[in-house]
Interface confidence: low
């Protein structure tokens, strides 16, 4: 009976890093000649193991191929990576001169590699968004096999529906990549919020991988700015307060102007933090009434996170308007930049 090359396993599934055993037996000792293992068929096939010559550090034979009556040509390939996936053929050669001649091939064993996805990476917009703005986040994970994978988005524990999720390549490959995009509507309470991308795969058991984006890195909450007058501490003094409330991030510059001229430059040090993650800042400005006979427009100018300045004016009437020489009247103008005289 003519020699047959038997590869009993149609397919083998191995986890990355483990050892794959590819089984092969021959039904006869005749004809005499070596066995070679190849990945793939045809002229482009790759030599994996050659019984006759060469050294194959990752390949070991299951049985002793030097024994005369050996008909087991199974091999083990160590430290499997996704790049090892493919169909492996056990091929019997007949001794020839000058070269051995291919005699018979096994049916092939498909080696599939289980590889874990990389930890998901979540990226967001380059510029900060503002409340009510829609911003996109992208989650990417790569290097997994097989292709089946589940990706979910969450914001503060609530599942979000992605705009688009793609697994590439679409055809058969040694490993795969996933990319998903979700749209989030920002709100002013999002400074403490997180967007989470969760990837589940057969290689991860019941422990999905998570990628996290802190919305604090992607949101800008502009301050509300108010100028108020405190009760006078003495006959010839007025206390003005400029309050910037509920802003994020903390980058803030505050300038006091008198009639349009810079009077004081604040670089806030002691910000107070609100429970929602935003900040408040209060700046006090002492006005000396004896120095002002005419009306003076005091301006609080707030620059937040390199955005255009927010301006609030407050007019203080000078001595010329006052029947009582010891007092000063003030007119706030918190909503406009023009003077109220």
């Amino acid at each position: 009976e003519e020699l047959q090359v038997i590869q009993p396993d149609k397919s083998v599934l191995v986890a990355a890093g483990e050892t794959a055993t590819l089984r092969c037996t021959a039904t006869s000792l005749i004809p005499v000649g070596p066995i070679q293992w190849f990945r793939g068929a045809g002229p482009g096939r790759e030599l994996i193991y050659n019984q006759k010559e060469g050294h194959f550090p990752r390949v070991t034979t299951v049985s002793d191929l030097t024994k005369r009556n050996n008909m087991d040509f199974s091999i083990r390939i160590g430290n499997i990576t996704p790049a090892d996936a493919g169909t492996y053929y056990c091929v019997k050669f007949r001794k020839g001169s000058p070269d051995d001649v291919e005699f018979k091939s096994g049916a092939g064993t498909e080696l599939s590699v289980r590889a874990k996805p990389s930890p998901p990476e979540v990226s967001g917009p380059a510029d900060r968004g503002i409340p009510d703005q829609k911003v996109n986040f992208t989650c990417k994970s790569h290097g997994f096999s097989p292709r089946n994978i589940t990706l979910k988005w969450f914001k503060d524990g609530q599942e979000l529906h992605p705009l688009e999720t793609t697994v590439n390549p679409s055809g058969k490959n040694v490993s795969y990549n996933i990319s998903s995009t979700v749209r989030v509507v920002l709100n002013s309470m999002d400074v403490n919020s997180k967007v989470i991308c969760e990837v589940a795969h057969i290689t991860l058991d019941r422990s999905p991988l998570r990628g996290i984006a802190n919305l604090s890195n992607f949101i800008r909450v502009s301050p509300t700015v108010k100028v108020t007058q405190q009760s006078p501490t003495s006959m010839n003094q007025v206390n003005l307060t400029c309050r910037a409330e509920r802003f994020y991030p903390e980058d803030l510059q505050l300038i006091w102007l008198e009639n349009g001229n810079v009077s004081r430059n604040d670089t806030p040090k002691n910000l107070t933090k609100n429970t929602d993650g935003t900040y408040n800042y209060t700046s006090l400005f002492l006005v000396n009434s004896s120095a002002h006979r005419e009306d003076v427009v005091f301006t609080c100018q707030v620059k937040h996170d390199q955005q255009p300045a927010i301006t609030r004016n407050h007019t203080v009437l000078g001595f010329a308007h006052s029947s009582d020489q010891g007092s000063m009247q003030t007119f706030p103008d918190n909503n406009a930049t023009h003077n109220w005289n």
Epitope: L47, I48, R58, A83
Partner: antibody, heavy 123, light 107 residues
């Protein structure tokens, strides 16, 4: 028996080009990747990269990207190393050496070596 | 890059002695390690692959051992033809890298 035979010693001036050959015999040339290794006087052996003898695709180590080129003449079972715009620091002995299949980079133990080609770059 | 350290540049021995050449990898290379012997004016000769497997024709007085980061080439019953330089090389990760070599000389 398996042999890798390299071309003879070379003396070149800076800025010139040199092409070193490595002829393989005794085995199936396209079954094994061909690597190049540099041994400068008093320095550690340095792997330059390899060429896939089946597809002709070269892979270069970072330090050897740019002026260095691997090529093949498959019909003659010969691999070549060309170095352009020679510099004094290219003075060294260059070895060709084979590794088993190239289906994965793990197969990087060099079982057979050429005798080496001495290159001297001097003005 | 993975750095292969052969801490001893020279080792003195006598004929018939047993000597151990060590090699340390800067990170785990599994058993993807080879040993080579080089004599002056010659090309390196392959001795060991996969940390402990001898190439065909290499005398059994040469033994390789180790895995991970620490490797040893042991020569028992040193012969005069063993006086040479010995290099280790990792092939776990690109770029493939060599140790600086250990020269075996007579006491």
């Amino acid at each position: 028996q398996i042999q890798l035979v390299q071309s003879g010693p070379e003396l070149r001036k800076p800025g010139e080009t040199v092409k070193i050959s490595c002829k393989a015999s005794g085995y199936s040339f396209t079954n094994y990747a061909m690597n190049w290794v540099k041994q400068a006087p008093g320095k550690v052996l340095k792997w330059m990269g390899f060429i896939n003898t089946y597809t002709g695709e070269p892979t270069y180590a970072d330090d050897f990207k740019g002026r260095f080129a691997f090529s093949l003449e498959t019909s003659a079972s010969t691999a070549y190393l060309q170095i352009n715009n020679l510099k004094n620091e290219d003075t060294a002995t260059y070895f060709c050496t084979r590794t088993r299949g190239y289906y994965d980079f793990d197969g990087g133990a060099f079982d057979y070596w050429g005798q080496g080609t001495s290159l001297t770059v001097s003005s | 890059d993975i750095v292969m350290t052969q801490s001893q540049k020279f080792m003195s021995t006598s004929i018939g002695d047993r000597v151990s050449v060590t090699c340390k990898a800067s990170q785990n290379v599994g058993t993807h390690l080879a040993w080579y012997q080089q004599k002056p004016g010659q090309s390196p000769k392959a001795l060991i692959f996969s940390a402990s497997y001898r190439y065909i024709g290499v005398p059994d007085r040469f033994t390789g051992s180790g895995s991970g980061t620490d490797f040893t080439l042991t020569i028992t019953n040193v012969q005069s033809e063993d006086l040479a330089e010995y290099f280790c090389q990792q092939y776990n990760t690109y770029p493939l890298t060599f140790g600086a070599g250990t020269k075996l000389e007579l006491k």
